[in-house]
């Protein structure tokens, strides 16, 4: 059920999920300095049904000198919602999946959170995928990645964009870098089933991308 | 096909230090935690730590803090665990297991404390 | 920590028969429950996460339930490649930890 590959990766671009299924899992790492606390989780768990989703357990840091302190942070529901409009700007925002039965949103920051996240995505998940600044899509489909279950093996759909440079001009369709097909690597090519992949995403903000839909960025 | 490859035994003096190792493949190393693992003869599995080979980020369970380090070679998709100032209650066979869910088991490594 | 106790040691069943293994947690531990199987050989294998949800490759007749403290592990159709000791473990509160396990013989 869960994916065992990243996601395809895009040259100049990248990808963000906006909700996560239910049985994603997010590591509770802390930053250099601070650790679990004792007894706290280890990952937090999109869980639920098909009509609600949420993350169960809460991630918590303390500093690795003082044994008792103990911060977390988690957002009222309108301190949500802001988070969740930010993340929302796009002109070329898809479906809002947040609303979407059986997913999950972006979880809240917790205090001293580890600058990078490790998900793990499950069957199912989709990602979509923008050009980074000072780059523009030429679109041949859908800028989207899938994470699909084929003859008991997990694959991802290969998005179809490139990002070109905002003064090179457009290249011909013969110049194009090879793309794999919308149905991801040949069957040959996928490998063996395995159940389970963790996800680095960096937390730390991009310079200014006005019109990003991303407040993260993934690698 | 995942597959954790450990060597079959090791043996060391009181007193020194051993270092075991994982070999990951089938899999994209980086894209996973790894946890190690300590079953003395006829008890249960005792948890001792992972790491994130990507990040180089570690925690371990308070008992084994001292005892023990873990490291991850991303090149050779290869996780190792040196447990250090060996004892005889350090005899037992270490696992190496991917993930938080376990899904996939070394064979495990007898370490053998001896003199 | 929390103690994961698996109160039966060992359990003798014959082919064929349905077989339960229990487990009991100190204290609630909201499903994150995953089972294991040690062959003779030492082999170990995952065989449900979160209470309930099947590893792939695992046969069917394996499953699971449990909530809060009490947890078990249900052999629909024992067969004799079934026989091995099997370990419960708490998977998400830090330090994970197990029971200590419950051997499972042909009669």
């Known amino acids: 059920e869960l994916c065992d590959d990243d996601p395809p990766e895009i040259p100049h671009a990248t990808f963000k999920a906006m909700a996560y299924k239910e049985g994603t899992m997010l590591n509770c790492e802390c930053k250099r300095g601070f650790r679990r606390i004792k007894s706290g989780s280890l990952y937090m768990l999109c869980t639920g049904n098909s009509s609600h989703s949420s993350w169960d357990n809460q991630c918590q840091c303390t500093s690795s000198a003082t044994r008792n302190t103990t911060k977390q942070v988690t957002p009222q529901p309108e301190e949500q919602k802001e988070r969740k409009t930010t993340e929302m700007q796009s002109p070329m925002q898809p479906v809002d999946q947040a609303s979407l039965p059986g997913h999950c949103r972006e979880p809240p920051p917790w205090e001293n959170e580890a600058t990078e996240r490790i998900y793990h995505f499950v069957v199912g998940q989709m990602v979509y995928y923008q050009c980074v600044q000072g780059y523009r899509a030429l679109h041949r489909g859908p800028a989207e990645s899938v994470c699909k279950m084929t003859h008991g093996k997990t694959r991802w759909t290969q998005p179809q964009l490139i990002c070109t440079g905002e003064m090179e001009t457009s290249q011909f369709p013969g110049e194009e870098k090879p793309q794999a097909s919308p149905e991801g690597r040949p069957e040959s090519e996928t490998s063996c089933l395995v159940t389970t992949t963790d996800f680095q995403i960096q937390t730390e903000m991009a310079a200014t991308m006005e019109t990003s839909i991303f407040t993260t960025e993934y690698q | 096909q995942v597959q954790l490859q450990q060597p079959a035994a090791e043996l060391a003096r009181p007193g020194a230090s051993v270092k075991m190792s994982c070999k990951a493949s089938?899999?994209?190393?980086?894209?996973?935690?790894m946890h190690w693992v300590k079953q003395r003869p006829g008890q249960g599995l005792e948890w001792i730590g992972y790491?994130?080979?990507?990040?180089?980020?570690?925690e371990y369970n308070q008992k084994f803090k001292d005892k023990t380090t873990l490291t991850a070679d991303k090149s050779s998709s290869t996780a190792y665990m040196q447990l250090s100032s060996l004892t005889s209650e350090d005899s037992a066979v270490y696992y190496c297991?991917?993930?938080?869910?376990?899904?996939?088991w070394g064979q495990g490594t007898t370490v053998t404390v001896s003199s | 920590d929390i103690q994961m106790t698996q109160s039966t040691s060992s359990l003798s069943a014959s082919l064929g028969d349905r077989v339960t293994i229990s487990c009991r947690a100190s204290?609630?531990?909201?499903?994150?429950l995953n089972w294991y199987q040690q062959k003779p050989d030492g082999t170990v294998k995952l065989l449900i996460y979160y209470t309930s949800r099947l590893h792939s490759g695992v046969p069917s007749r394996f499953s699971g339930s449990g909530s809060g403290t009490d947890y078990s592990l249900t052999i629909s159709n024992l067969e004799q490649e079934d026989i091995a000791t099997y370990f419960c473990q708490q998977g998400n509160t830090l330090p994970p930890t197990s029971g200590g396990g419950t051997k499972l013989e042909i009669k």
């Open positions: 204290q609630d531990i909201r499903n994150y």
């Open positions: 089938g899999y994209t190393f980086t894209t996973s935690t």
């Open positions: 297991a991917r993930h938080y869910y376990f899904d996939y």
């Open positions: 790491i994130n080979p990507r990040s180089g980020y570690t």
